[in-house]
Interface confidence: low
């Protein structure tokens, strides 16, 4: 092959980084460079020498080398927030190249404490019992106390304390959130005894009252989301779903969900009504299929929601963004490395997907032109491109026995996104592929059937 | 679903040591943070040590530099080495574990007795 300089990719986790590990790691990768001469180092966005840094062997792959470099930084240091990213920087006999590689935003956040009372004919059994329910959410880093007083003195039986998740988010620091019950008998509740969730967090303490005499008249809270048709779902499933999500419903038996059109013509629409939530309100969702060409051609949906306990009906519209640039993925695929091939345990094979524009994205591996179960795989979220705005880069991990890989078995990724011309592109590889092959097709559907 | 499987407890003389193991099974594709904790009678369960999917452990401050967390990532599976074990590290240890994306989920081993004498 013919020299060339190597192109740069920052490696971050596709998780922010926990905060209470003692340092983060993020990675450079470089890639399709030739003479194997390469040199990593790594600075600060102030241009001062970064020291912790592990380097990995380059690896031979059509004819051109790829290799990556490591940093640890001390999570303390992350965590001021001082620098967003910092700089990989190479050098090579064909050009020198640098990398911004942003860093997993570490934050302590508070934690916001709810107490949610049971309804009035919300106590069962003998004797009649029912449960507070007190959520801290938002906060960080994980460790956190929870602890119930029953009029200032401490509660010691009764109490479930779930363990601590962490909230679904698609950027920002990463937040946590934990549920602790309160098992109340009737008549303490209505003899007006005042119950407090007590949450201890980063050395401060949080506490949120309840009781009979303190419950406000239930207000309409009921709120209106109007989700659109993910990319993923009409590829897979060949129909533009709208999907209506009605929340805080005290009641169910009233509420009616419909979608109409531009032109006020009503779309038929399918409404499930979900079981009581822990907060004693339901949820329903109302979905109507309406034709792909009208949604991109930008056509208005009005989701209209009505409940008895509605003054008026709430309506919220959507339709297709405009003026979106549509930029088609690049994708990589990355043999085993051999450092883990030698130890032979388990092979991991990476689909990295790049440059692409909206960050609807869909991933699939194939093998032996069957899809593999995801349970095989895991697939980050897009993240932005650092330096190209409004960009965005994925990657995808499959991983297979040592065993399996050696036997010469091809494993195909299938990335699918609507900038591409037919929707879809692959690429396959396997023990003797040193490239990769690619392939732009269309007519996947007996794909996706299963 | 994520089953967790602990072994390795039991019963030590002051100074001695132990070594935990726990395997994850089931849907244990997206395992990211493997790790122990422990609760001793009529405290809360507390951090012990935990290693994340890219090898960086943490640890307690009262088992720093006497335990060693490890982990084997093609058999899914997070061991504690205890040593110089001491009557406070008396607790039922719990294997623990988080799985999925973007949600991640907690997952939680039935716990394993650790009883040091003095």
């Known amino acids: 092959g013919s020299a060339s300089a190597p192109t740069l990719f920052p490696l971050v986790s596709c998780e922010n980084s926990p905060s209470d590990t003692s340092s983060v790691a993020v990675g450079c990768l470089a890639q399709d460079f030739l003479p194997d001469s390469i040199t990593f180092s790594w600075k600060y966005k102030n241009n001062s020498d970064i020291s912790s840094t592990r380097g990995f062997p380059s690896v031979l792959r059509g004819g051109k080398y790829a290799a990556t470099s490591q940093v640890l930084l001390p999570s303390k240091d992350v965590m001021q927030g001082t620098d967003e990213h910092v700089v990989c920087k190479v050098q090579h006999p064909n050009g020198n190249k640098e990398k911004n590689v942003p860093l997993p935003v570490i934050a302590e956040l508070p934690p916001k404490v709810s107490v949610f009372v049971p309804p009035r004919d919300g106590f069962f059994g003998n004797p009649r019992k029912s449960k507070l329910i007190c959520q801290a959410t938002g906060f960080s880093p994980r460790q956190i106390q929870v602890s119930w007083l029953r009029e200032g003195k401490q509660v010691g039986s009764g109490v479930t304390t779930d363990q601590v998740q962490a909230e679904a988010k698609e950027s920002g620091p990463t937040t946590y959130k934990v549920t602790s019950t309160l098992t109340i008998k009737e008549s303490d509740w209505l003899g007006q005894s005042m119950f407090t969730c007590r949450v201890d967090h980063r050395g401060l303490t949080f506490q949120q009252n309840a009781s009979s005499m303190c419950v406000p008249d239930q207000d309409t809270a009921i709120r209106v989301f109007a989700i659109p048709p993910s990319f993923a779902s009409i590829f897979l499933t060949k129909s533009t779903k709208l999907t209506c999500l009605v929340t805080d419903l005290t009641t169910y038996d009233s509420v009616t969900i419909s979608w109409t059109r531009q032109n006020g013509e009503a779309v038929k629409t399918h409404t499930n009504i979900s079981e009581s939530h822990p907060n004693a309100t339901f949820s329903a969702v109302g979905e109507a299929s309406i034709c792909e060409d009208d949604w991109n051609s930008g056509e208005r949906f009005t989701c209209t929601v009505t409940h008895t306990d509605l003054p008026s009906p709430l309506k919220q519209t959507i339709s297709r963004p405009k003026g979106v640039a549509l930029h088609r993925p690049d994708v990589y695929l990355l043999p085993p490395a051999r450092e883990q091939l030698n130890l032979r345990e388990s092979a991991t094979i990476t689909c990295l997907v790049t440059g692409f524009s909206p960050a609807d994205v869909f991933v699939q591996w194939m093998q032996r032109g069957q899809p593999l179960s995801p349970e095989k795989y895991v697939t980050s979220a897009p993240m932005p491109e650092p330096q190209a705005p409004g960009r965005y880069f994925a990657h995808s991990i499959l991983t297979v026995s040592e065993e399996e890989w050696n036997t010469g078995e091809t494993y195909t990724c299938v990335v699918a996104h609507e900038a591409l011309p037919n929707r879809v592109t692959e690429r396959t590889v396997d023990k003797s592929t040193e490239g990769e092959v690619s392939a732009d097709e269309e007519g996947f559907e007996n794909l996706w059937a299963t | 679903c994520v089953q967790l499987l602990e072994s390795g407890g039991g019963l030590v003389q002051f100074g001695g040591s132990l070594r935990l193991s726990c395997a994850a099974s089931?849907?244990?594709?997206?395992?990211?943070?493997m790790g122990w904790y422990h609760q001793a009678p009529g405290k809360e369960r507390e951090l012990v040590a935990i290693i994340t999917s890219g090898g960086v452990a943490e640890y307690a401050a009262s088992v720093k530099g006497r335990f060693t967390i490890s982990r084997d990532y093609a058999k899914n599976t997070v061991y504690l080495q205890m040593n110089s074990l001491q009557p406070e590290d008396t607790a039922v240890y719990y294997c623990?574990?988080?799985?999925?994306?973007?949600?991640?989920?907690?997952?939680w081993g039935q716990g394993t007795q650790v009883t040091v004498s003095c």
């Open positions: 089931g849907n244990s594709f997206s395992i990211s943070n």
């Open positions: 623990h574990c988080e799985s999925g994306f973007p949600t991640l989920i907690a997952y």
